[in-house]
């Protein structure tokens, strides 16, 4: 049966026993800035082009053992959430991956900047259709990272990022705090904000909307047919990147402002239990859970 | 995220270093009264001192970025410091990434075309 997260983002009239918009997002290229990925996993084979871009710091610790499946874990799962054949949102989207996070899931602002610059140069050399950039990472507030995101957004690129998993104000983190970026918090099957250990999803006025981000089934790098459940605002951001890809594939001329407006318009309203947020943040945090548009664009979204 | 509101720095640290009038022999001194700023991550464990993104003013050309980077290296060498230019940015933001001692920040902030300098910091998978 359909995983809870795909059911949650699917308009009611499409909730059959399976989620299958077979060509969703086919006109859009989604760039993923993350760890290395297992690009020939059955769930994503042929859908992800691994670019030759790599800019990562060395792993911490003298006894660190680099295990390929662990190195690929985060990125493979997210690629599966965006475009996986069986558990993906935008099953028609093609992806390009850039490695900016090392085997411990750590990167640098500078490496991310160079990755964003690589995307801009690729766009200039070979203009294609609409571009979505997924940044499933967060660091402290960074003026330069936010500035780079702003420039890329002004070049017509849609950037989607994780709000962060620090149970804190997203405005204190980057790229979550960049106004031009679509910043995504995480909710669970009960429409509760996601708790992650002692922490959880970030919140506040720098968050644009929430999306499923707990117990999300996706491709596992443990084997070529394996699936695994992962949680976090990265998974939530991947859902919104997939939804954005489908919207842009249906309406390639959408501006960032129009896309943002549509994402908000089609979201489920006031379903999140706000008691989880600090009192002073409740009014600032959007009570929106991302969803695909309903039947108005049946022929476009579900070809 | 969340367009339409003022950008807020939170507890982001900003060091504003006023430019001195004596210019260390620079041909292209900045306009009078402008200040370049230094920024670093407010979360100390995430800081990566020793690597800095030098961001130049918006209309700076690639050739000027390269020239500014070389100038920094030359001035640092005169003071006995080794520096390494790791990357020259163009396409999104003009500037360069440099590996150098923090002692050279004041010098770097006085370079022509410099808008601000940010110390590198860590980002993490979420």
């Amino acid at each position: 049966s359909i995983p809870w997260n795909l059911e949650r983002i699917t308009p009611p009239r499409y909730r059959a026993d399976e989620y299958q918009p077979p060509d969703g997002g086919s006109l859009v290229e989604v760039y993923l800035l993350d760890t290395s990925i297992q690009s020939d996993h059955r769930e994503i084979e042929g859908r992800v082009m691994v670019t030759d871009f790599e800019n990562v710091p060395e792993e911490d610790g003298t006894r660190f053992h680099r295990q390929a499946s662990k190195c690929d874990s985060h990125g493979t799962h997210l690629a599966g959430v965006v475009s996986g054949r069986d558990a993906g949102v935008a099953k028609g989207a093609s992806m390009r991956s850039l490695r900016v996070l090392n085997c411990q899931g750590k990167g640098t602002v500078s490496g991310t900047l160079i990755g964003l610059e690589f995307i801009r140069k690729s766009q200039l050399v070979q203009p294609v259709g609409p571009l979505v950039v997924l940044l499933p990472l967060a660091g402290g507030y960074s003026r330069v990272l936010n500035a780079a995101c702003q420039r890329l957004a002004r070049a017509g690129v849609v950037l989607v990022t994780a709000a962060g998993n620090f149970r804190d104000d997203a405005c204190l983190y980057s790229p979550a705090s960049a106004p031009e970026v679509i910043t995504v918090g995480a909710t669970n099957a009960q429409d509760q904000p996601v708790t992650l250990g002692t922490l959880g999803t970030n919140f506040g006025r720098c968050v644009d909307l929430f999306a499923p981000g707990e117990d999300i089934i996706g491709a596992s790098s443990d084997c070529s047919t394996c699936f695994v459940s992962q949680s976090g605002t990265s998974q939530a951001a991947a859902h919104v990147a997939g939804i954005a890809a489908m919207m842009l594939s249906a309406e390639p001329e959408l501006t960032l402002a129009e896309l943002r407006q549509r994402l908000i318009h089609f979201s489920a309203k006031d379903v999140i239990n706000e008691a989880w947020f600090p009192e002073d943040q409740r009014v600032l945090t959007p009570n929106l859970v991302a969803a695909l548009p309903p039947s108005t664009h049946e022929n476009l979204y579900f070809q | 995220g969340a367009m339409g509101q003022e950008d807020e720095d939170g507890d982001y640290e900003e060091l504003v270093l006023a430019l001195r009038s004596e210019e260390d022999g620079l041909a292209e001194a900045p306009e009078h009264g402008t200040t370049a700023t230094f920024h670093r991550c407010a979360k100390d464990p995430w800081r990566l001192p020793g690597t800095y993104v030098v961001v130049l003013k918006e209309e700076t050309h690639l050739s000027q970025s390269e020239r500014t980077a070389r100038r920094l290296q030359a001035q640092a060498a005169r003071r006995g410091y080794l520096t390494k230019i790791l990357h020259v940015f163009h396409g999104l933001l003009p500037g360069f990434l440099v590996k150098m001692s923090g002692d050279l920040l004041e010098l770097a902030l006085k370079l022509p075309h410099v808008d601000y300098i940010e110390e590198d910091s860590s980002v993490f998978a979420q």
């Epitope: 084979e45 042929g46 691994v50 069986d86 | -």
Partner: antibody, heavy 115, light 109 residues
Framework: QVQLVQSGAEVKKPGASVKVSCKAS????????ISWVRQAPGQGLEWMGW????????NYAQKVQGRVTMTTDTSTSTVYMELRSLRSDDTAVYYC????????WGQGTTVTVSS | QSALTQPASVSGSPGQSITISCTGT?????????VSWYQQHPGKPPKLMIY???NRPSGVSIRFSGSKSGNTASLTISGLQAEDEADYFC?????????FGGGTKLTVL
């Protein structure tokens, strides 16, 4: 264009081993693994397993597990399928195909097991 | 015995439409979006005609279409032509492997 080119026909005695090669070209190798499928005379298709060009990982069908070994040589973009302890019912045309989706196929290699 | 069940043979006259079924279980056809159909002419390798239930690779005629309901997938060929005479195989993912149907011989009368 995307191509998979296989090695030539083989005749083997029962108990022997056979090694079939498949050279891939015309696409980004790491985006797909290679599946091996066989077809006995007048019969249907049987999936034997898969190997990754990315990291060399394998996934073998239960029926041939223990007798089959798939390997890659990334320097020559070639995949090998070795089948040991051959029996007469291993007589078949052996195909390599691109990925699990099997969207492109090699021309086939006839393996005859006969005493 | 194959994991997926197909009729051994079907036939139709030129211009007609025919449908070939492929029945599995919730662990294969019913559980995945990845049902494929292959055409094989004698002495040739199989050729992919439909992937992921209903998608056609470029170069494949629009006369070929695929669908799925529950544990059964179907291949429909409309406007039957002489060159469609061939064997047709379905395949599906399982949790760890791939399975094929036994094949259907299509005769164009």
């Amino acid at each position: 264009q995307v191509q998979l080119v296989q090695s030539g026909a083989e005749v083997k005695k029962p108990g022997a081993s056979v090694k079939v090669s498949c050279k891939a070209s015309g696409y980004t190798l790491t985006s797909y693994g290679i599946s091996w499928v066989r077809q006995a005379p007048g019969q249907g298709l049987e999936w034997m397993g898969w190997i990754s060009f990315y990291n060399g990982n394998t996934n073998y069908a239960q029926k041939v597990q223990g007798r089959v070994t798939m390997t890659t040589d990334t320097s020559t973009s070639t995949v090998y399928m070795e089948l040991r302890s051959l029996r007469s019912d291993d007589t078949a045309v052996y195909y390599c195909a691109r990925g699990y989706g099997m969207d492109v196929w090699g021309q086939g290699t006839t393996v005859t097991v006969s005493s | 015995q194959s994991a997926l069940t197909q009729p051994a043979s079907v036939s139709g006259s030129p211009g007609q439409s025919i449908t070939i079924s492929c029945t599995g279980t919730s662990s294969d056809v019913g559980g995945y979006n990845s049902v494929s159909w292959y055409q094989q002419h004698p002495g040739k390798p199989p050729k992919l005609m439909i992937y992921e239930v209903s998608n056609r690779p470029s170069g494949v005629s629009i006369r070929f279409s695929g669908s799925k309901s529950g544990n059964t997938a179907s291949l429909t060929i409309s406007g039957l032509q002489a060159e469609d005479e061939a064997d047709y195989f379905c395949s599906s993912y399982t949790s760890t492997s791939m399975v094929f149907g036994g094949g259907t011989k299509l005769t164009v009368l």
